[in-house]
């Protein structure tokens, strides 16, 4: 009932619950003293289904006959209407026509599955129902399956149809039966190639041709006898994308042509009996599996540096980088390292594992080459040969109005132009940078790009951190000799956390030298630009005064000669980078004790 | 009233081909499977090989893979069998049969003899 | 494959006997198992298909039993026409085979 009907009543015959097709008696009536006056014909009832008004009467009650309700539940309400006042619900009623039972479709599970039918029942009735399956094949066959569960919506006929005559047709229907009555549904008509699904494909194996070419490799698996169709699909494991071929008739092997060495790939396969009947099995279990290593394509990226010994030694260090996994094509066991002396032929071959630098010493005569290749387990890269020279002595090679920019919180735009001179004999250009660090340099990595010879900025972004400075020299090379520039740079930047130390004031003929600590290198927070030193008399208010000087990497320390004699002064240092100033390093009290003038 | 008329049969020498022929008529052919089912003399029967209707799906015996070609021309009603690389142990009368939930109609048969 | 072996292989029976042949599948079949008849020199007659049920124009004293494995043949009074060999053969899967035989002989 539609809310609590404290005015009246609404009542259905036959039942509330009919087939399609009945008729429904409704009648609605008023409970005593509920009407808008005693005078009955003043009391207009008024029927609506759903929102329409479908019949209406004067008195206190209502009869309608209502017939061709639709499937599903239909709401009827009864109100009251008073002169000069609202319509007042007194009652309502919801009428449900049985639904048939909807959307059978049947599916056999593998070539010796059984047939299994399912279907929707319709909206809830709340009557007791039975459901009666039925499939009937050809020459009269005929099989039945009952389901007493209310709620059934799933049979299995539990018998398989055969391949061997796979263009039989078979019809199956569902009966829903109970008190009302009985409804079927439509009939499902088909063959055993429209409703068997195959077992997905098993005991996948993969097979690579010999050492060779792996572009080829053979899948190969095990099939249901009367798959025709079946598609492939494979990728990397570290891949989302997946590779899809459709192949016919393939009888249990496939052989793949795009495979990529060295990379563990996901195969899964799915097999489907024909090209426009029945359904995809489900996806085989996946195989893993790696492809064979191939020999090293590409060649190294190979640069160098050399350092000046002694009169008649050289330190060369070579670093190259990692060839890209699809250049390696395998583990790279080692490299190999060849030193040659052209005139005189002397050759030092050396395989290094676990690094990609090398460093020697060599005599500071001769012409050198070197040869760089990569090896794994198929065997070597091509070798990249250079030869060995003097890479800033060219003056006139030297690019200039070098600059260098923050672009972003790791990376740096660098910035030159051409050599003066020469210009048509550059090559490439080579942008170079390490983190600055005094002192002893050696065992900071070195980075490096190449740039093509019309080229004149490059964004570097590879081991780039805030708030460090790095040194940075492009490298303008020819056929035989290279000129250099270089500049301090620093992507994102601030002030210095803190000033210089101040560790020593000594008196030098009528001056004073300053020495100080430099600020610990986390704490630079990008590249010094400045050196600040401030002093003022002790216990005076005036100005300090200050003397700016330009950062130079080994400097740590700088003359002052404009104190006076026998004044006790108070001295500190700030640093600054192109973002601001330091706060004051430490203060410092220092009398002169020259003559005065 | 289905038929099925085998043709073709003969004497052929070991490693000889010959052609087998049924012509159906009575039933609407392309809507069956077609079969070729064989009997040595004094043996039981062997089936040989099927076809569906739309020669989509093909079956053979593993004893005569191979050297058996089984084809149909729906427009003709005919169903075929190429026998190629004959031994004597393909000697049988051989017959064409419709499938439905097995052998329901079969032709009167054609003998092949294979001897040298 | 999937084997059939049919007992006995030979019955001797009089008109008027009930006689009962056997068939049994290497593995599951469910119901697709046939029976034919078959006389000297000529086609099989088909006389059972889906294990149980009569081929037109099969005289009913002939009958089919059996699922999954195990199958039987049974003619309830033998007539005069009925003495011939007797084969099964299944239909779930192919390759397609068919028992041995069973003759049935006068008495």
């Known amino acids: 009932k539609i809310d609590e009907c404290k005015r009246g009543d609404v009542t259905v015959k036959p039942s509330r619950v009919i087939l399609l097709g009945s008729t429904v008696n409704i009648s609605c009536s008023l409970k005593p003293r509920q009407g808008c006056s005693p005078y009955s014909r003043r009391n207009k009832l008024i029927l609506y289904k759903f929102d329409r008004r479908i019949n209406f009467h004067h008195g206190h009650s209502l009869n309608a006959q209502v017939t061709g309700l639709p499937l599903g539940t239909t709401l009827f309400v009864c109100k009251l209407a008073c002169i000069n006042s609202d319509e007042i619900q007194i009652c309502g009623a919801e009428i449900l026509v049985g639904e048939q039972p909807q959307n059978l479709s049947c599916i056999q599970k593998g070539e010796q599955g059984t047939v299994a039918c399912t279907w929707e029942r319709g909206q809830d009735t709340h009557l007791y129902t039975e459901y009666t399956l039925q499939l009937s094949g050809p020459k009269n066959l005929t099989w039945q399956k009952q389901c007493k569960d209310h709620y059934c919506d799933y049979l299995d006929f539990g018998i398989n149809l055969t391949p061997e005559s796979p263009e039989s047709n078979f019809t199956a229907k569902v009966t829903a039966v109970n008190s009302l009555g009985s409804s079927s549904s439509f009939p499902s008509t088909f063959t055993f190639l429209d409703i068997v699904r195959p077992l997905p494909p098993w005991d996948i194996r993969i097979k690579f041709q010999k050492a060779s070419s792996v572009s080829r490799c053979t899948l190969y698996w095990r099939d249901e006898g009367l798959v025709l169709l079946n598609r492939l699909r494979y990728r990397p494991s570290n891949s989302r994308h997946w590779n899809m071929v459709n192949v016919t008739e393939a009888r249990g092997r496939h052989d793949l042509l795009d495979l990529k060495p060295f990379t563990e790939y996901e195969f899964q396969i799915s097999s489907k009996l024909h090209l426009y009947k029945g359904s995809w099995s489900d996806w085989s279990e996946t195989l893993r599996a790696q492809t064979p290593e191939e020999e090293p394509t590409g060649m190294l990226d190979v640069w160098y540096m050399k350092r000046h010994i002694d009169y008649s030694r050289q330190q060369i260090s070579l670093f190259w980088k990692n060839l890209s996994v699809s250049e390696a094509r395998g583990k790279i066991l080692h490299y190999q390292v060849t030193l040659q002396e052209l005139t005189g032929g002397k050759v030092m071959t050396q395989n290094i594992t676990g690094h990609t630098s090398w460093t020697t010493v060599i005599s500071r005569t001769g012409n050198w080459a070197v040869a760089v290749s990569a090896a794994n387990s198929k065997g070597n890269s091509l070798p990249t040969r250079i030869n060995i020279m003097n890479l800033c002595e060219a003056g006139l090679l030297a690019p200039h109005q070098v600059s260098a920019n923050s672009e972003s919180m790791d990376s740096i735009l660098v910035t030159w132009q051409p050599p003066r001179k020469d210009l048509s004999a550059v090559q490439e250009y080579v942008v170079e940078w390490r983190q600055l660090h005094p002192g002893d340099d050696t065992q900071i990595p070195l980075n490096w790009l190449r740039s093509p010879p019309y080229n004149v900025s490059a964004l570097i972004s590879e081991n780039i951190k805030p708030y460090t400075c790095y040194e940075i020299r492009v490298y303008a090379l020819s056929e035989d000799q290279g000129g250099c520039s270089s500049i301090l740079g620093n992507s994102e930047h601030k002030a210095p956390l803190s000033g210089p130390h101040i560790n020593a004031i000594t008196e030098e003929k009528g001056s004073i030298l300053i020495s100080w600590n430099s600020i610990p290198v986390q704490e630079q927070m990008g590249c010094l630009l400045h050196y600040r030193i401030y002093w003022k008399e002790r216990d005076s208010n005036s100005q300090p005064q200050l003397c700016e000087i330009p950062y130079r990497v080994s400097q740590n320390s700088h003359p002052i000669n404009s104190l006076q004699p026998r004044v006790t002064y108070v001295l500190w240092m700030t640093a600054l980078t192109a973002a601001g100033e330091s706060s004051q390093g430490n203060e410092r009290e220092f009398c002169l004790q020259g003559k005065a003038n | 009233e289905v038929l099925l008329v085998e043709s073709g049969g003969g004497l052929v020498k070991p490693g000889g081909s010959l052609r087998l022929s049924c012509a159906a008529s009575?039933?609407?052919?392309?809507?069956?499977?077609m079969n070729w089912v064989r009997q040595a003399p004094g043996k039981g029967l062997e089936w040989v090989s099927s076809?569906?209707?739309?020669?989509?799906?093909?079956h053979y015996a593993d004893s005569v893979r191979g050297r058996f070609t089984i084809s149909r021309d729906n427009a003709k009603n005919s169903l075929y069998l190429q026998m190629n690389s004959l031994r004597a142990e393909d000697t049988a009368v051989y017959y064409c049969?419709?499938?439905?939930?097995?052998?329901?109609?079969w032709g009167q048969g054609t003998l092949v003899t294979v001897s040298s | 494959d999937i084997q059939m072996t049919q007992s006995p292989s030979s019955v001797s029976a009089s008109v008027g006997d009930r006689v009962t042949i056997t068939c049994r599948a290497s593995q599951g079949i469910s119901i697709w198992l046939a029976w034919y008849q078959q006389k000297p020199g000529k086609a099989p007659k088909p006389l059972i298909y889906?294990?149980?049920s009569l081929q037109s124009g099969v005289p009913s004293r002939f009958s089919g039993s059996g699922s999954g494995t195990d199958f039987t043949l049974t003619i309830s009074s033998l007539q005069p026409e009925d003495f011939a060999t007797y084969y099964c053969?299944?239909?779930?899967?192919?390759?397609?085979?068919f028992g041995g035989g069973t003759k049935v002989e006068i008495k």
């Open positions: 889906a294990a149980s």
């Open positions: 009575g039933f609407t052919f392309s809507s069956y499977s």
């Open positions: 076809i569906s209707s739309s020669s989509d799906y093909i």
């Open positions: 053969q299944q239909a779930n899967s192919f390759p397609l085979t």
């Open positions: 049969a419709r499938s439905e939930l097995g052998f329901d109609y």
